[in-house]
């Protein structure tokens, strides 16, 4: 029977800068029941606080609700493992909520095949930002990435969409069923998980574009739609 091994805080994530959760890995338990507590202070203060919620994030976690989440403040935290034989402490972890944001995936991904009479067909997709993110505050800039592949293909084709919430793709294989997904990340932070796959059947008469044409065609489509919207 021994004191517990050293725990490690290995991850902290926030869905929206308003709340966050940290998780730790226990060390060895020394063969005895072990209690864990996470304590922290905010930089510039010496008053220590204890984790307010050990439940919400699951085992070996600490969840910080809205009233415990401060923007622009660094948290200095550690985990203490205690059993009958003694205690051990994790290394201190410095956490700034700004840099640990991992949003939920974008929502409402819709995909359509557009076949204008006078131009080449294209795949058009649009989506919404995740619910928890309030883009109106200006705190957030979300960047988006799309991936798609024919249903039976192994490799994904990835496109960076920047801040826009719609995208057009011209080079597709006619007659194939495609899977399409989108994900997002804040300017500082982590990519979300991919959204659930949306399936789209590409018609057999879809005109295949070569890659070089893609950019030119996309610009033509953008110009054409912009022209239509404003006149």
């Amino acid at each position: 029977q021994l004191p517990p091994g050293k725990p490690e805080i290995f991850k902290c994530r926030s869905p929206n800068k308003e709340t966050f959760t940290c998780w730790w890995r226990p060390g060895t338990d020394g063969g005895l029941p072990t209690n864990y507590s996470l304590t922290y202070h905010r930089e510039g203060e010496t008053l220590m606080h204890e984790c307010p919620d050990y439940i919400t994030g699951g085992p070996n976690s600490c969840h910080f609700g809205k009233q415990y989440t401060s923007m622009w403040r660094t948290y200095v935290m550690m985990v203490n493992a205690t059993n009958q034989m003694g205690s051990s402490f994790s290394d201190e972890l410095y956490v700034d909520v700004t840099y640990i944001v991992q949003p939920d995936p974008p929502l409402e991904l819709t995909v359509e095949v557009k076949q204008p009479e006078d131009r080449k067909p294209y795949l058009w997709m649009k989506w919404s930002p995740p619910t928890l993110i309030d883009l109106k505050t200006g705190w957030f800039t979300l960047l988006y990435e799309i991936r798609l592949k024919p249903e039976k293909a192994a490799e994904w084709e990835t496109h960076f969409a920047g801040q826009q919430t719609e995208f057009k793709i011209l080079s597709l294989h006619p007659g194939q069923k495609y899977l399409v997904q989108v994900r997002c990340k804040p300017d500082h932070g982590y990519w979300s998980a991919w959204s659930p796959a949306t399936f789209i059947q590409i018609p057999s008469d879809f005109i295949m574009n070569d890659g070089l044409n893609d950019i030119f065609e996309a610009q033509k489509i953008e110009w054409h739609e912009h022209h239509h919207h404003h006149h």
Partner: antibody, heavy 118, light 106 residues
Framework: EVQLVESGGGLVQPGGSLRLSCAAS????????MNWVRQAPGKGLEWVAY????????YYADSVKGRFTISRDNSKNTLYLQMNSLRAEDTAVYYC???????????WGQGTLVTVSS | DIQMTQSPSSLSASVGDRVTITCRAS?????LHWYQQKPGKAPKLWIY???KLASGVPSRFSGSGSGNDYTLTISSLQPEDFATYYC?????????FGQGTKVEIK
């Protein structure tokens, strides 16, 4: 509605002991740091002790260290202050207060009077 | 320990007056909080995080400051504002109050 109700005050002789209780309701008691603050008759406010949500962190004012013990029972939504070796200068109204996030003392109980006198 | 020094310790003012109470901390703070107390009553949180008004506090109250120096201002004193006001720091152990400023009717 958040409520904090103190009890256990009374008259005690110097050197005696007393245990104060604070019954909390209307919020998730186990998520909040709690404090005792006191006020001697006609004097200002003095912070006495702090206990974190899971009792891992405890602080005392120097004036009570070694004599007072703060504790809590989250299953009973109750905060305690065990006061030993009481002195005349401990005479005060004792208030139970909570920390709301980083906002100290957003709610207070009505207070309980402790009088130390022979 | 962080010492909190309020000034003045008491003041007499008339309804409609502008009143300013100051609080100086012996060490630099990030935030300071203010409480109002009326005789025979428990104190109430009045201003938190230096400048945020607690629920139900009239907009004639304001708080400001940074570092070591903070102020509570009442732009136009009303009869219900006559009370004692305490500043408080909750950033470092031990937690400390100012000695209080009693606002009395002139």
């Amino acid at each position: 509605e958040v409520q904090l109700v103190e009890s256990g005050g009374g008259l005690v002789q110097p050197g005696g002991s007393l245990r104060l209780s604070c019954a909390a309701s209307g919020f998730t008691f186990s998520s909040f740091g709690m404090n005792w603050v006191r006020q001697a008759p006609g004097k200002g406010l003095e912070w006495v002790a702090y206990i974190s949500s899971g009792s891992s962190i405890i602080y005392y004012a120097d004036s009570v260290k070694g004599r007072f013990t703060i504790s809590r029972d989250n299953s009973k939504n109750t905060l305690y202050l065990q006061m030993n070796s009481l002195r005349a200068e401990d005479t005060a109204v004792y208030y139970c207060t909570r920390f709301y996030g980083y906002i100290p003392f957003d709610y207070w109980g009505q207070g309980t009077l402790v009088t130390v006198s022979s | 320990d962080i010492q909190m020094t309020q000034s003045p310790s008491s003041l007499s003012a008339s309804v409609g007056d502008r009143v300013t109470i100051t609080c100086r901390a012996s060490s630099s703070l990030i935030y300071l909080h203010w409480y109002q107390q009326k005789p025979g009553k428990a104190p109430k949180l009045w201003i938190y995080d230096t400048s945020k008004l607690a629920s139900g506090v009239p907009s004639r109250f304001s708080g400001s400051g940074s570092g070591n120096d903070y102020t509570l201002t009442i732009s136009s004193l009303q009869p219900e504002d006559f009370a004692t006001y305490y500043c408080f720091q909750g950033s470092g152990y031990p937690l400390t109050f100012g000695q209080g400023t009693k606002v009395e009717i002139k």
